[in-house]
Interface confidence: low
C-alpha cells in the first residue's frame, strides 16, 4: 500500500516536472542566425524557455507569451579586425507556457 | 568602451551557462525503453543531466560520472488489470560533466 507522505513526495516531483518556463542555456549565434564569420562571446546566455512534461503524448509544452531581454555580449568578427565590441543582443524569453496539441487539428479529422 | 562591472556581469552569466549537471525533466518510459502498454505516473521525473555550453564547436558537453537514483512511481499496465503499483525506478543522474570532442580523433588525422 502507499501512504500519504509518499504520495505527497510524488505529487511535488510531478509539479516540478510540469510544463513551465525554465532557465535554459541558449546559443546566441543559432538563435540569431548570424553569418559564420561573426561570433559572440560568451556564445551562450541564460534565458527562460518552456520545458517540462505534459500529461498526454498528443500535447507539447509551448510558449504562450514571450518577452525579449537584452544581453550584453562581445561581437567578434573573424579574422579579428578590431577590439571585440560589446553589443546588446535581444533574446526571446518565454514568460508563459501551456500544453498544446502538437499540430492544429484538421477541421474534419 | 566597456567598464569592469559590465565584464563582471558577463563573466558571471558565462559561468552559469557552462557545461555542468543541470536539473532536467526526463520521460521515464523513454529512459527505460518500456513496452507501449506500460505507463508511469508521473510520466516524468527530475534528475541532473549534463547541459550547457562548451567554448568550442568541436566539443560537446558529456557526462564523466553517473549515479543512479531511485524514484517512486506508479506503474500502470494497459488495459488496467490491477491497482496501480508503486515501484522504485532507477534513473541515471549525471554527477560530473566535461566538454569532450564530439568524436574520438583519428590517430593519423
Amino acid at each position: 500500500f502507499y501512504d500519504i507522505e509518499t504520495l505527497k513526495v510524488i505529487d511535488e516531483e510531478w509539479q516540478r516536472t510540469q510544463c513551465s518556463p525554465r532557465e535554459t542555456c541558449v546559443e546566441v549565434a543559432s538563435e540569431l542566425g548570424k553569418s559564420t564569420n561573426t561570433f559572440f562571446k560568451p556564445p551562450c546566455v541564460n534565458v527562460f524557455r518552456c520545458g517540462g512534461c505534459c500529461n498526454e503524448e498528443s500535447l507539447i509544452c509551448m510558449n504562450t507569451s514571450t518577452s525579449y531581454i537584452s544581453k550584453q555580449l562581445f561581437e567578434i568578427s573573424v579574422p579579428l579586425t578590431s577590439v571585440p565590441e560589446l553589443v546588446p543582443v535581444k533574446v526571446a524569453n518565454h514568460t508563459g507556457c501551456k500544453c498544446l496539441p502538437t499540430a492544429p487539428r484538421h477541421p474534419y479529422s | 568602451f566597456y567598464d569592469i562591472e559590465t565584464l563582471k556581469v558577463i563573466d558571471e552569466e558565462w559561468q552559469r551557462t557552462q557545461c555542468s549537471p543541470r536539473e532536467t525533466c526526463v520521460e521515464v518510459a523513454s529512459e527505460l525503453g518500456k513496452s507501449t502498454n506500460t505507463f508511469f505516473k508521473p510520466p516524468c521525473v527530475n534528475v541532473f543531466r549534463c547541459g550547457g555550453c562548451c567554448n568550442e564547436e568541436s566539443l560537446i558537453c558529456m557526462n564523466t560520472s553517473t549515479s543512479y537514483i531511485s524514484k517512486q512511481l506508479f506503474e500502470i499496465s494497459v488495459p488496467l488489470t490491477s491497482v496501480p503499483e508503486l515501484v522504485p525506478v532507477k534513473v541515471a543522474n549525471h554527477t560530473g560533466c566535461k566538454c569532450l570532442p564530439t568524436a574520438p580523433r583519428h590517430p593519423y588525422s
Epitope: 579586425t81 578590431s82 577590439v83 565590441e85 | 558577463i10 563573466d11
Partner: antibody
Framework: QVTLKESGPALVKPTQTLTLTCTFS??????????VGWIRQPPGKALEWLAN???????YYNPVLRSRLTISKDTSKNQVVLTMTNMDPVDTATYYC?????????WGQGTLVTVSS | DIVMTQTPLSLPVTPGEPASISCRSS???????????LHWYLQKPGQSPQLLIY???NRFSGVPDRFSGSGSGTDFTLKISRVEAEDVGVYFC?????????FGGGTKVEIK
Amino acid sequence: QVTLKESGPALVKPTQTLTLTCTFSGFSLSTYGMGVGWIRQPPGKALEWLANIWWNDDKYYNPVLRSRLTISKDTSKNQVVLTMTNMDPVDTATYYCVQVTNPFVFWGQGTLVTVSS
Amino acid sequence: DIVMTQTPLSLPVTPGEPASISCRSSQSLVHINGNTYLHWYLQKPGQSPQLLIYKVSNRFSGVPDRFSGSGSGTDFTLKISRVEAEDVGVYFCSQSTHVPWTFGGGTKVEIK
C-alpha cells in the same frame, strides 16, 4: 579603481632582449572579455601598438614586429610580460601598458627604455 | 597598415578662440558591424594619453563639452570651441577598426 604600472630596465644594449612587466589592479585578466596590451612612443613621435593578450590567452601582435615580440600573462599575480628581442637604438621609446577596451581608457604611466651601447 | 595623417602638426592658439584638428585615414574606418572606431586622445606634457572622444563623436566621461568630434569614412575632425590653457598638449587620433591599430602623428596645441 583600475591602475597599471610598467617596470623594466631603463637601459638596454643593442641586440639584447628587453623584458617589461605590467602589474595591474582593479580588474582581473581571468574576467571574460578582458585584455591587456602594450603601446610604445619614441621621443617626440607617434604612438605604436605592439601586442595584446586576452583573458582566454589569445595573443595578437603588430605584424611588423611579430617575430621579435612575445606576450604572456600570470593571472594569479595580475601581471603581463612583454619580451622584445634584438633591441636596436630605434626601439628607444616610452613603453605603455594599457587595459584593452575599445577604445583604450586606462593607461600606465609609461617606462622610458633607452637602447644604447 | 592604415595610415593616419593629422594636420596641422602644430597649432598655436589664443585662449577663448576655437581650434580644429583634422585626421585622415588611408582607408575607410567603417567596420563591418557598422561602427566607426575613430578615437581622439590628448597627451598632456609628461603624462600618458587620455581618452577624449570615442567612436568619432562620443565624449568620454568627464570631458568638457567644448570638445566635439565629427566626420565619417576617412575624414575626421576634432574641434575645441573655446581653447583653455589646460588644453595644451599633443592630440592624437587613433583607429581600432583594422589590425594593427594605428595612431596619427599628433598635433601639438600650444598657447600663443
